[in-house]
C-alpha cells in the first residue's frame, strides 16, 4: 500500500538536489580559492540536517545555524549589491564588476540559487513531488526560511554605501513584501551603513521618466531615512549600455547619463 504523502501547492525538490548542492560547493571552492578550507561534505550534511525529517511548515532559522556556521564568509562589506525582482541583471553586473557581490555570489547563496527543497516529518526522504508554497501553504518552509536567514545575515554585514538594483518595469518598483523590502531593508545597520543607493532599471527603450520619483521609491526613502540611513536614487535608462560601460568605462559614450 503506497504511503499517504502530503500534497503541497508548490513544485517539489529540484531533481538531483543533493548532487547539485555538492557539485556547486566543490565548484565554488574552485572558483573562489579563498574558500578552499570549506568541507563540502560537511556543508551538505548541515544543509540536509536543516530540513530532513522535519515538518516542511515548521522550519526555523535555528535549523539553518549549523549550515550558516560552515558557510561563514567575509565579503567586503562596502561592496554589497542587493536586488529585487531583477536578479539576472544584478548577476550580470557582478560578473563584470568582480569586486562587488550579490548574495548569490557568496557560498550559501550560490549553493541554493534557483533550487527548491523540502523533506517530510519523521522520514529521511526528500520530497521530490511537492513542497509548500509561501502563499498557499506556509511561510516557514525550508526554502523561504533559508533565504530569510541568509538575506538577513548578508544585510547585517553591509557597510558604507550599499547598492540595490530595482526593476523599474514592475508596478511596485519597491515592494515591501519582497525579500529586499521585508528582510534586507530592516537589517541594514545604521551604525555601519551610511547610504543606500537605489539603481532603478528601466525596461522600455523610450522610457525617459524619472522613476526615482515613483511613490514606492518615496516609500523606500521614507523607511530608510527613518532608520537614519541616507538614501539616493539613480535611473538606469539603458541597462544594456550600463553593462557595456561597466565592462569598458573608457568608452567615449559612457560619460553621458545611462
Amino acid at each position: 500500500v503506497p504511503r499517504w504523502r502530503q500534497q503541497w501547492s508548490g513544485p517539489g525538490t529540484t531533481k538531483r538536489f543533493p548532487e547539485t548542492v555538492l557539485a556547486r560547493c566543490v565548484k565554488y571552492t574552485e572558483i573562489h580559492p579563498e574558500m578552499r578550507h570549506v568541507d563540502c561534505q560537511s556543508v551538505w550534511d548541515a544543509f540536509k540536517g536543516a530540513f530532513i525529517s522535519k515538518h516542511p511548515c515548521n522550519i526555523t532559522e535555528e535549523d539553518y545555524q549549523p549550515l550558516m556556521k560552515l558557510g561563514t564568509q567575509t565579503v567586503p562589506c562596502n561592496k554589497i549589491l542587493l536586488w529585487s525582482r531583477i536578479k539576472d541583471l544584478a548577476h550580470q553586473f557582478t560578473q563584470v564588476q568582480r569586486d562587488m557581490f550579490t548574495l548569490e555570489d557568496t557560498l550559501l547563496g550560490y549553493l541554493a540559487d534557483d533550487l527548491t527543497w523540502c523533506g517530510e516529518f519523521n522520514t529521511s526522504k526528500i520530497n521530490y513531488q511537492s513542497c509548500p508554497d509561501w502563499r498557499k501553504d506556509c511561510s516557514n518552509n525550508p526554502v523561504s526560511v533559508f533565504w530569510k536567514t541568509v538575506s538577513r545575515r548578508f544585510a547585517e554585514a553591509a557597510c558604507d554605501v550599499v547598492h540595490v538594483m530595482l526593476n523599474g518595469s514592475r508596478s511596485k518598483i519597491f515592494d515591501k513584501n519582497s525579500t529586499f523590502g521585508s528582510v534586507e531593508v530592516h537589517n541594514l545597520q545604521p551604525e555601519k551603513v551610511q547610504t543606500l543607493e537605489a539603481w532603478v532599471i528601466h525596461g522600455g527603450r523610450e522610457d525617459s521618466r524619472d522613476l526615482c520619483q515613483d511613490p514606492t521609491i518615496k516609500e523606500l526613502e521614507s523607511i530608510i531615512s527613518k532608520r537614519n540611513i541616507q538614501f539616493s536614487c539613480k535611473n538606469i535608462y539603458r541597462p544594456d549600455k550600463f553593462l557595456q560601460c561597466v565592462k569598458n568605462p573608457e568608452d567615449s559614450s559612457c560619460t553621458s547619463e545611462i
Partner: antibody, heavy 114, light 107 residues
C-alpha cells in the same frame, strides 16, 4: 580514514616523461579538489595546480603550464600528474593534497638523471 | 604572483619557550592564509587555515593571527616534537604561493 597514497620513486632520463599517481580513499573523491605541490631538496614548496575531480576542470600555476598535466580517473578514485620534457630541474618530491583539512600524500621522489 | 616573505630563516628556542614566526604577503590576501609544519622526512601537515583557525587535532599551543598582509604563527610552550620547518601559504588567488620556510631548532 582519509588517505592519499602516491606512487613510488621514479628514476628517469632527461627528455622523457613520467606519470605520478595519487590514490584517494576514505572519502567521496568528487567532493574535494586535489592539488599538487613540488618540493626540491632543501628548498621551499611550489604550487603546481589543482583539479576538480567531479568536472575535470583545472587551474595551473603559469610556471607549470606545458610541464604538468593533471587528470583524474573517477572509477579508481585516482588523481594523476603527468610531467613531460623532464630536466634535472624537475628532480624533486611531488605531493598531492586534498582541499579541506589539508590531507597530503606521502610524496613521490622524482630523480631525472642521465 | 603574490610573494609570501618569511624573513626568519632559522629560529632557536628551548623547550617551554614561545616563538612567533612571521609572514608578509606582497598584497592584501584577506585571511586566506594557511600554516604548515614539516617535520624531518615527513609530508607537510596543515596547522592553521583562514589565518587563525586551528585544524582538529592541532594542539592549542599553535596560534595563528593576522589579516591583510601581515601574519604570525605563534608556538607557545614549545615541545621537542615541534622541531620542524614552518611554511605559510596564501590561497587568496591562483597560483597559491608559499613562504620560503622557517626552520625551528630546539636548543
Amino acid at each position: 580514514q582519509v588517505q592519499l597514497q602516491q606512487s613510488g620513486p621514479e628514476l628517469v632520463r632527461p627528455g622523457t616523461s613520467v606519470k605520478v599517481s595519487c590514490k584517494a580513499s576514505g572519502y567521496a573523491f568528487t567532493t574535494y579538489l586535489v592539488e599538487w605541490i613540488k618540493q626540491r631538496p632543501g628548498q621551499g614548496l611550489e604550487w603546481i595546480g589543482v583539479i576538480n575531480p567531479g568536472s575535470g576542470s583545472t587551474n595551473y600555476n603559469e610556471k607549470f603550464k606545458g610541464k604538468a598535466t593533471l587528470t583524474v580517473d573517477r572509477s579508481s578514485t585516482t588523481a594523476y600528474m603527468h610531467l613531460s620534457g623532464l630536466t634535472s630541474d624537475d628532480s624533486a618530491v611531488y605531493f598531492c593534497a586534498r582541499y579541506a583539512y589539508g590531507y597530503w600524500g606521502q610524496g613521490t621522489t622524482l630523480t631525472v638523471s642521465s | 604572483d603574490i610573494v609570501m616573505t618569511q624573513s626568519q630563516k632559522f629560529m632557536s628556542a628551548s623547550v617551554g619557550d614561545r616563538v612567533s614566526i612571521t609572514c608578509k604577503a606582497s598584497q592584501n590576501v584577506g585571511t586566506a592564509v594557511a600554516w604548515y609544519q614539516q617535520q624531518p622526512g615527513h609530508s607537510p601537515k596543515q596547522l592553521i587555515y583562514s589565518a587563525s583557525n586551528r585544524y582538529t587535532g592541532v594542539p592549542d599551543r599553535f596560534t595563528g593571527s593576522g589579516a591583510g598582509t601581515d601574519f604570525t604563527l605563534t608556538i607557545s610552550n614549545i615541545q621537542s616534537e615541534d622541531l620542524a620547518d614552518y611554511f605559510c601559504q596564501q590561497y587568496s588567488t591562483y597560483p597559491f604561493t608559499f613562504g620560503s620556510g622557517t626552520k625551528l631548532e630546539i636548543k
